[in-house]
């Protein structure tokens, strides 16, 4: 019983939440809250938007982003791409892990020019010590953050 | 090996399924089937729509709801909100954990009067003993329950 | 500590990815890549599109499919069904586990005839040794595979 409890307490897990500072507009990944409210890190590190593995193994990684807008401004892509990407010292470029494409702008109803849509990604990937996972959304201007419950990013070892 | 198997057998987990009685129309949370078919409880309790933690720790909680309709009836909001909420003795009000907003009614095509959409939520949250998690959908009349495979609610300790 | 690490290394898990050969057009389930790139099997087997349990227990199973098209061809159903199904020697027919219905064709915007949508399913189910889980999409012609990051299928024991 002690063994079982210890194994849960040590199992790497994290849940990071959206915040006003999440959208940088710099072309970088989304940034996240790591401590306040529902956010926490247990056996994983955080660095500039990335969850960083401290222990090698398979992790279920997940992210949800809340999308929303009024109509679909011409300057915005009509296709939104939401993805989880791996950064590793072994490759110079980010590696796509899990990706979704949506066309949410067409969801405005005849009644309402405002539309909402949500994109959820989750899957098991292998991470070596020091490897990082980040979230990107293109076009990030359509991401709605608010209170940390609608857009988030997390992981746990399986 | 015995230790490893025991740890799996004792690990809190649950999967609850939609049923005809899930929609109360009372403004309360959705109710769920806990025993029949695919539904089960292992190390978690159930009470009036809520999964109740018997063991403190981090849980991956999830819910999917199937939404459907013909057009978008006037009495229904054009935005549907699907959320997982925590009830705790420490606060008088429910706490938002994971929330999605969708605008599904605009999805009927010229080809089709009937539209379908699905909302999935999942994420890691901390629960103390006795804390509860419930699912709410506004407007719940658009939720399709029926056979238990299209709308469901579950959790497991990570 | 050794015990805990061993338990993770032995915990059944898999992540299978979409490939050019995934869509058979034969009415069968989707087929998957099991070794290349992000795909792996650990303590689970694979057979003709199915993840096969080697160890009885509760598994979190998941699948995402990327859907896309140009308009909505009349020959295609306007409702897309994405589901996870169990095959067991105890029943002659597949058993629905987790299912979603979407109406993605209505998502083309006035800006763009091309639409994209994504369907994610995940939930905890019980599998006996030898029982299989497969993914089906109707109509599978709308599934977009590309590089294995957009459509995938996985599981891990909880």
């Amino acid at each position: 019983l002690i063994q079982e409890r210890r194994s849960h307490q040590n199992n790497p897990a994290a849940h990071l939440t959206g915040a006003n500072s999440s959208l940088t507009g710099s072309g970088g990944p989304l940034l996240w809250e790591t401590q306040l409210g529902l956010a926490f890190l247990r056996g994983l590190d955080y660095h500039d938007g990335a969850l960083v593995a401290n222990k090698a193994g398979y992790y279920y990684i997940y992210s949800k982003v809340q999308l929303g807008g009024v109509g679909c401004p011409l300057g915005l892509a009509s296709t939104i791409t939401h993805g989880l990407y791996k950064r590793t010292p072994r490759y110079p470029e980010e590696l796509e892990l899990l990706v979704s494409q949506q066309s949410p702008c067409g969801r405005a109803t005849s009644n309402s020019r405002v539309w909402w849509d949500s994109s959820f990604l989750g899957g098991v990937v292998h991470l070596e010590v020091g490897e990082e996972v980040v979230v990107r959304v293109l076009d990030e201007r359509l991401v709605r953050l608010r209170d940390g419950t609608r857009s988030y990013f997390g992981a746990f070892m399986v | 090996l015995i230790q490893e198997r025991r740890s799996h057998q004792n690990n809190p987990a649950a999967h609850l399924t939609g049923a005809n009685s899930s929609l109360t129309g009372s403004g309360g949370p959705l109710l769920w089937e806990t025993q029949l078919g695919l539904a089960f409880l292992r190390g978690l309790d159930y009470h009036d729509g809520a999964l109740v933690a018997n063991k403190a720790g981090y849980y991956y909680i999830y819910s999917k709801v199937q939404l459907g309709g013909v057009g978008c009836p006037l009495g229904l909001a054009s935005t549907i909100t699907h959320g997982l909420y925590k009830r705790t003795p420490r606060y008088p009000e429910e706490l938002e954990l994971l929330v999605s907003q969708q605008s599904p009614c605009g999805r009927a095509t010229s080809n089709s009067r009937v539209w379908w959409d699905s909302s999935f939520l999942g994420g890691v949250v901390h629960l103390e003993v006795g804390e509860e998690v419930v699912v709410r959908v506004l407007d719940e009349r658009l939720v399709r329950l029926r056979d238990g495979t299209r709308s469901y609610f579950g959790a497991f300790m990570v | 500590l050794i015990q805990e690490r061993r338990s993770h290394q032995n915990n059944p898990a898999a992540h299978l990815t979409g490939a050019n050969s995934s869509l058979t057009g034969s009415g069968g389930p989707l087929l998957w890549e099991t070794q290349l790139g992000l795909a792996f099997l650990r303590g689970l087997d694979y057979h003709d599109g199915a993840l096969v349990a080697n160890k009885a227990g509760y598994y979190y199973i998941y699948s995402k499919v990327q859907l896309g098209g140009v308009g909505c061809p009349l020959g295609l159903a306007s409702t897309i069904t994405h589901g996870l199904y169990k095959r067991t020697p105890r029943y002659p027919e597949e058993l629905e586990l987790l299912v979603s219905q979407q109406s993605p064709c209505g998502r083309a915007t006035s800006n763009s005839r091309v639409w994209w949508d994504s369907s994610f399913l995940g939930g905890v189910v019980h599998l006996e040794v030898g029982e299989e889980v497969v993914v089906r999409v109707l109509d599978e012609r709308l599934v977009r595979l590309r590089d294995g990051t957009r459509s995938y299928f996985g599981a891990f024991m909880v």
């Epitope: - | 013909v70 009937v114 | 409702t79 219905q101």
Partner: antibody, heavy 121, light 107 residues
């Protein structure tokens, strides 16, 4: 109880006009799509028009397009069918029907008793 | 327009018989199909919606099945009030259409 009552039918000459009404009671009228369906003597059922609850989106069968107009007044719990340029083949019993369209419940579950329209010279 | 073809157009059966009526759609309508019963001089009554869902208050001897293009209505044990005309109707696509009807008569 839930009820639909049609009125306004009668005998009319070819080329003439009629306005049918359907009074709803016992339910929240504004939550439902409403349909008009007709049945010629000794024949099957033919859908002719519907109107959405939310934004008054309207569709017609080709056989009546340009001649018939469906409308509703949610404040009065009433559905209407304005029929112009009537032809002999429009002779039928006209039914209004409520259509459910959300979640687990679909279909035209409540029908009126029908009103007879006869087009004859 | 989507055409619904019912078969047979008529059939003779006795009380207690099992009866099956088919409805074929000219293109895929998913599960957006309803079945109605109409007795002479009466309004149509909804029996089944969404291809297989039994309407509240309808006896369980009525069973709907199928999806896509092929649908069936089965009456497991015919009762006297079941001698009537049965219609299928698709509500997936405009214009809404009904099948031509199947008349169930007393043998």
């Amino acid at each position: 109880q839930v009820q639909l009552v049609e009125s306004g039918g009668g005998l009319v000459k070819p080329g003439g006009s009629l306005r049918l009404s359907c009074a709803a009671s016992g339910f929240t009228f504004s939550d439902y799509y409403m349909n008009w369906i007709r049945q010629a003597p000794g024949k099957g059922l033919e859908w002719i028009a519907d109107i959405s609850s939310r934004d008054n989106t309207i569709y017609y069968a080709d056989s009546v397009k340009g001649r018939f107009t469906i409308s509703r007044d949610n404040a009065k719990n009433s559905l209407y069918l304005q029929m112009n340029s009537l032809r002999a083949e429009d002779t039928a019993v006209y039914y209004c029907a409520r259509e459910r369209g959300f979640g687990d419940y679909f279909g035209m579950d409540v029908w009126g008793q029908g009103t007879t329209v006869t087009v004859s010279s | 327009a989507i055409q619904l073809t019912q078969s047979p157009s008529s059939l003779s059966a006795s009380v207690g018989d099992r009866v099956t009526i088919a409805c074929r759609a000219s293109q895929d309508i998913s599960s957006a199909l309803a079945w109605f019963r109409q007795t002479p001089g009466k309004t149509p009554k909804l029996l089944i919606y969404d291809a297989s869902s039994l309407e509240s208050g309808v006896p369980s001897r009525f069973l709907g099945s199928g999806s896509g293009t092929d649908f069936t209505l089965t009456i497991s044990s015919l009762q006297p009030e079941d001698f009537a005309i049965y219609y299928c109707q698709q509500f997936n696509t405009y214009p809404l259409t009904f099948g031509g009807g199947t008349k169930v008569e007393i043998k």
